[in-house]
């Protein structure tokens, strides 16, 4: 019968011929009376056999990632009779892996959006690298992820590539971050190959800013001839949030005379001071009112940023009009 062991050849061998193993018949007594032949894909071009001894050699550099095994056929013939000594047999040459491929991030570019002020541990995104080396061959394709840029705001789980928040971030201070992740094979041991990817992480807005008046004092004037409903001036608060988080409502906090009202222009986010009752210069020539401003909608968990509404004082001077 045929005698052989499992055949392995390391990929990327640079030698002109590399001895893989021996194929022989147990009837072969070593007197060179048998001839061994190799058939099949790769026979003669990639692999050769010593016709006398049955020794098999690889004569080409192999790439496991291109082809990981070769199925060949062997024949042994009695030179004297020209007849087969053994039935033709199929055997396999496996190409064994070396760590010649670096991890690659195939889904880049990565981009993620996460709400500002998210707590530590919040999941941002998972990045995944793939390694063309053999996952069943040692640690050649076993990856470890690490953070090259992004501390102290982000962390990456070494085995999964899951990026999490490790420190609260405030959109109004910085609205986007570039995180650089490295994947290393060989679980980071010597001889490891690595690949990197960038992740753009954008912070979405939450309502963590209250509107605050630009000025602590406004001076307005109103003519005593002005009819009720007259707009006598505008006041303005700032809110550094965006979109609906910056929508605000103005209102009167103090007006003992109940002469004025404030309405909100939701297009411009300004407060418009309105005359609610007619004024009379001879009766009262100036007024002082206090206005306040609040966000339209604040979720309960963000109320700690909105403890006290901003107010402003408005001094209103009444202008005299000659009366008949």
């Amino acid at each position: 019968g045929w005698v052989w062991n499992q055949f392995f050849v390391p990929e990327e061998m640079n030698t002109t011929s590399h001895h893989i193993g021996q194929l022989r018949s147990d009837l072969d007594n070593g007197n060179n009376s048998f001839q061994y032949k190799l058939l099949g894909a790769g026979a003669g071009s990639t692999f050769i056999i010593d016709e006398r001894t049955g020794d098999i050699y690889a004569i080409q550099k192999l790439d496991r990632e291109e082809r990981s095994l070769y199925i060949l056929r062997a024949q042994v013939i009695d030179i004297a009779t020209g007849r087969a000594v053994e039935p033709e047999s199929e055997f396999v040459i496996k190409v064994s892996d070396i760590n010649d491929n670096e991890p690659k991030f195939l889904d880049e570019p990565y981009e993620a959006i996460v709400p500002e002020m998210s707590p530590e541990g919040t999941l941002v995104i998972q990045v995944t690298a793939s390694d063309a080396d053999d996952p069943s061959s040692g640690n050649n394709a076993r990856l470890l992820y690490s953070l090259l840029q992004g501390q102290p705001y982000f962390s990456v789980e070494p085995t999964t590539g899951v990026i999490r928040i490790s420190s609260k971030m405030d959109r109004e201070l910085q609205d986007e971050y570039w995180v650089i992740i490295q994947a290393k094979d060989m679980i980071g041991q010597p001889g490891a190959l690595s690949g990197t990817t960038s992740v753009l992480i954008k912070l979405s807005d939450v309502n963590d800013n209250k509107p605050i008046f630009k000025e602590s004092l406004y001076r307005l004037t109103v003519s005593e001839s002005a009819p009720t409903g007259t707009s006598i001036g505008t006041i303005m608060a700032y809110d550094n949030d965006i979109g609906e988080n910056a929508e605000m409502d103005y209102s009167i906090e103090e007006d003992d005379s109940q002469t004025f009202d404030i309405i909100t222009n939701h297009e411009t986010q300004e407060g418009i001071v309105i005359l609610k009752k007619k004024v009379d210069f001879e009766h009262q020539n100036h007024y002082g009112i206090r206005a306040k401003v609040k966000n339209h909608h604040v979720p309960e968990q963000l109320m700690k940023y909105h403890t006290e509404a901003s107010t402003t004082f408005i001094k209103i001077q009444v202008e005299d009009v000659d009366e008949p």
């Epitope: 201070l173 609205d175 630009k214 550094n240 700690k304 940023y305 509404a309």
Partner: antibody
Framework: QVQLVESGGGVVQPGRSLRLSCAAS????????IHWVRQAPGKGLEWVAV????????YYADSVKGRFTISRDNSKNTLYLQMNSLRAEDSAVYYC??????????????????WGQGTTVTVSS | YELTQPPSVSVSPGQTASITCSGD??????VSWYQQKPGQSPILVIY???KWPSGIPERFSGSNSGNTATLTISGTQAMDEADYYC?????????FGGGTKLTVL
């Protein structure tokens, strides 16, 4: 790393002028407003002036209004404080400090997150 | 606009220190706090009443209500001995408190 470095301090006579500089590195200078803050020997911090990231707005403390001018050159990553008509009470360590907050935010709610090491100005005859 | 701080506060190691800052309707504004050690530049420790800048331990906390803002340092350490300044914003100008010297006994 993120850094502000002041220079230009020294001893000057009352009524004379001095120009302080503040060189920025490690961040995008043109995205940040910058303040000048001073501290007289043994005293507390006193705000002097601020300039917006694009130079479009400048505000001053009443004590220096009309005498000091804040300016910036974003192409050189440098902030300046031109101090004229100097008085003895202007003697102090002058710090430049970055206004925290992205462009588009207003007010000074987020504090001053990066400070220089300071440069000393002494006004004395 | 004026902000008033006590000139000095003393605390034993491991105890809680509270430094106040008062101003008219201060609770309506946002307050920042700075730490300054001798010969050094100030460091921002709290902004917007109660938020931490990166790298500041959560032993430092802030609150602001009515006319008073408070900086609280829990589990005070010897390294916390410094001058502390509050800062607010009013009508386009910046205002600092007079500063409080924190002594860790």
């Amino acid at each position: 790393q993120v850094q502000l470095v002041e220079s230009g301090g020294g001893v000057v006579q009352p009524g004379r002028s001095l120009r302080l500089s503040c060189a920025a590195s490690g961040f995008t200078f043109s995205r940040y407003g910058i303040h000048w803050v001073r501290q007289a020997p043994g005293k507390g911090l006193e705000w002097v002036a601020v300039i917006w990231y694009d130079g479009s707005n400048k505000y001053y403390a009443d004590s220096v209004k009309g005498r000091f001018t804040i300016s910036r050159d974003n192409s050189k990553n440098t902030l300046y404080l031109q101090m004229n008509s100097l008085r003895a009470e202007d003697s102090a360590v002058y710090y430049c400090a970055r206004r925290a907050g992205i462009p588009g935010t207003t007010g000074y709610y987020y504090g001053m997150d990066v400070w220089g090491q300071g440069t000393t100005v002494t006004v004395s005859s | 606009y004026e902000l008033t701080q006590p000139p000095s506060v003393s605390v034993s190691p491991g105890q809680t220190a509270s430094i106040t800052c008062s101003g008219d309707r201060l609770g309506e504004k946002y307050v920042s706090w700075y730490q300054q050690k001798p010969g050094q530049s100030p460091i921002l420790v709290i902004y917007q009443d109660n938020k931490w800048p990166s790298g500041i331990p959560e032993r430092f906390s802030g609150s602001n209500s009515g006319n008073t803002a408070t900086l609280t340092i829990s589990g005070t350490q010897a390294m916390d001995e410094a001058d502390y300044y509050c800062q607010a914003w009013d009508s386009s100008t910046v205002v600092f408190g007079g500063g409080t010297k924190l002594t860790v006994l």
